[in-house]
């Protein structure tokens, strides 16, 4: 053996070095990689170095047993069965309330025969649900509406307005509440007329006297 | 009838560990999460987190994580909570209880609850 | 997570009047639950997903709200509806409750 080099190094199973004839001179750098399936334990980079001892042990390769963390989901909660995810595992998602799962909600960690463990799908996605709308309310008679539309988007609000010469009578505004099924937060409003409002309300009848009969009204009626 | 039974009370030392139980009946107990929730003596109220019988999965309110561990006996129906590294803190009333489906978000039954003492 | 604010912390009323109490979001809630809670003993589901009575509910009582604000109502007050009421919601994990309002019979 020459005594002007590191020791030769040698093929670790499940696995290959780079390069495969490394020069074994002072400085030379040797990457050791694992195949599909395996991974890499102890220091994957070895360094010949001025001593002409390597500058770490020889790695090896284990074979991998579990799924990589397939990570959270926005407006979810998940429930993991092992924390390390090895195959076998599961996690499942659940959106929150007003969210929609689009995907997957459990995944299950698969071994390969090639390869690393996979899990069964991607992760899902929850989405926004999309509410119902409302659907128009007519306008009071004597009175307006705006916007005038037949669906109002959930959350939206209308309001309502009477023709001159009428009060309204209920809320001048009303709201689409979200929900399943959106609704109205009020009954629609009515319009009234000023004046029988006022009559009702604070009059009282007068009867003024007759004058006195002639025939000449008498011919009028 | 559905019905969430819990195990009695305890008294506990500083630093312990406490398992509890609660024992479904009623309906299919793999048919549903169960949930564990506390409510300390300011009669607040948190969810600890929660465990689906059939796969054994859990997910823990972030503030429980290192507190509690929650798993099940699916041959007797029977969800448990172990809380480790008492304090005095962890004194409450802990409650099992159940959602209606998974497209629920509200606790439709709930254990009579498990007082639970810390103290030297 | 959403924190849950509810007033007030405690309020009493006589029989037959009408009660409010409200429940304020950190952040805004698609829905909000409500659970009675006496005193010895478990919460029960009291209205859920905002305005649905639970079986059992007198008609009494009415939810109502959206976005950050919510509210439950008694019409009118009975005897029997002296306790404390909690709100909740999950439209963000980890749920989270309010603090309650405990209801006292003048």
């Known amino acids: 053996p020459r005594n002007d080099t590191c020791p030769e190094l040698p093929e670790i199973p499940n696995g290959w070095k780079s390069p495969s004839q490394p020069e074994l001179v002072h400085g030379t750098v040797v990457t050791y990689q694992c195949y599909p399936g395996y991974q890499v334990v102890g220091s994957s980079v070895l360094m010949c170095q001025w001593d002409l001892t390597w500058s770490e042990d020889l790695p090896s390769c284990q074979r991998v047993t579990s799924c990589h963390d397939p990570g959270d989901v926005e407006h979810s909660r998940r429930l993991i069965s092992s924390p390390k995810f090895p195959v076998g595992a599961t996690v499942q998602y659940i959106c929150d309330q007003g969210f929609v799962l689009m995907g997957s909600s459990i995944l299950t960690c698969h071994d390969r025969q090639a390869g690393s463990p996979k899990w069964s799908d991607r992760a899902p996605k929850c989405l926004l649900e999309q509410l119902k709308p409302c659907h128009g309310l007519s306008a009071p008679e004597n009175g307006a509406r705006s916007p005038e539309k037949q669906l109002h988007p959930a959350g939206a609000t209308i309001h309502f307005s009477c023709a001159p010469g009428y009060v309204l009578k209920g809320q001048a505004s009303i709201k689409c509440v979200p929900g399943h099924p959106s609704h109205w937060s009020d009954p629609p409003p009515i319009c009234r007329a000023a004046s029988l409002d006022g009559f009702y309300n604070s009059r009282s009848l007068d009867v003024a006297k007759a004058p006195a009969a002639s025939s000449t009204l008498d011919a009028a009626h | 009838e559905v019905q969430l039974q819990q195990s009695g009370p305890e008294l506990m030392k500083p630093g312990a560990s406490v398992k509890m139980s609660c024992k479904a009946s009623g309906y299919t107990f793999t048919d549903y999460n169960m949930h564990w929730v506390k409510q300390n003596q300011g009669k607040s109220l948190e969810w600890i987190g929660e465990i689906n019988p059939n796969t054994g999965g859990t997910g823990y309110n972030q503030k429980f994580k290192d507190k509690a561990t929650l798993t099940v006996d699916k041959s007797s129906s029977t969800a448990y909570m172990e809380l480790r590294s008492l304090t005095s803190e962890d004194s409450a009333v802990y409650y099992c209880?159940?959602?209606?489906?998974?497209?629920?978000?509200?606790?439709?039954?709930w254990g009579q609850g498990t007082t639970l003492t810390v103290s030297s | 997570q959403i924190v849950l604010t509810q007033s007030p912390a405690i309020m009493s009323a006589s029989p037959g009047e009408k009660v409010t109490m409200t429940c304020s979001a950190s952040s805004s809630v698609s829905y909000m639950h409500w659970y009675q809670q006496k005193s010895g003993t478990s919460p029960k589901r009291w209205i859920y997903?905002?305005?649905k009575l639970a079986s059992g509910v007198p008609a009494r009582f009415t939810g109502s709200g959206s976005g950050t604000s919510y509210s439950l109502t008694i019409s009118s007050m009975e005897a029997e509806d002296a306790a404390t009421y909690y709100c909740q919601q999950w439209s963000s994990s980890p749920p989270t409750f309010g603090a309650g309002t405990k209801l006292e019979l003048k």
């Open positions: 997903d905002t305005s």
């Open positions: 209880a159940r959602i209606p489906s998974l497209r629920r978000y509200y606790f439709d039954y």
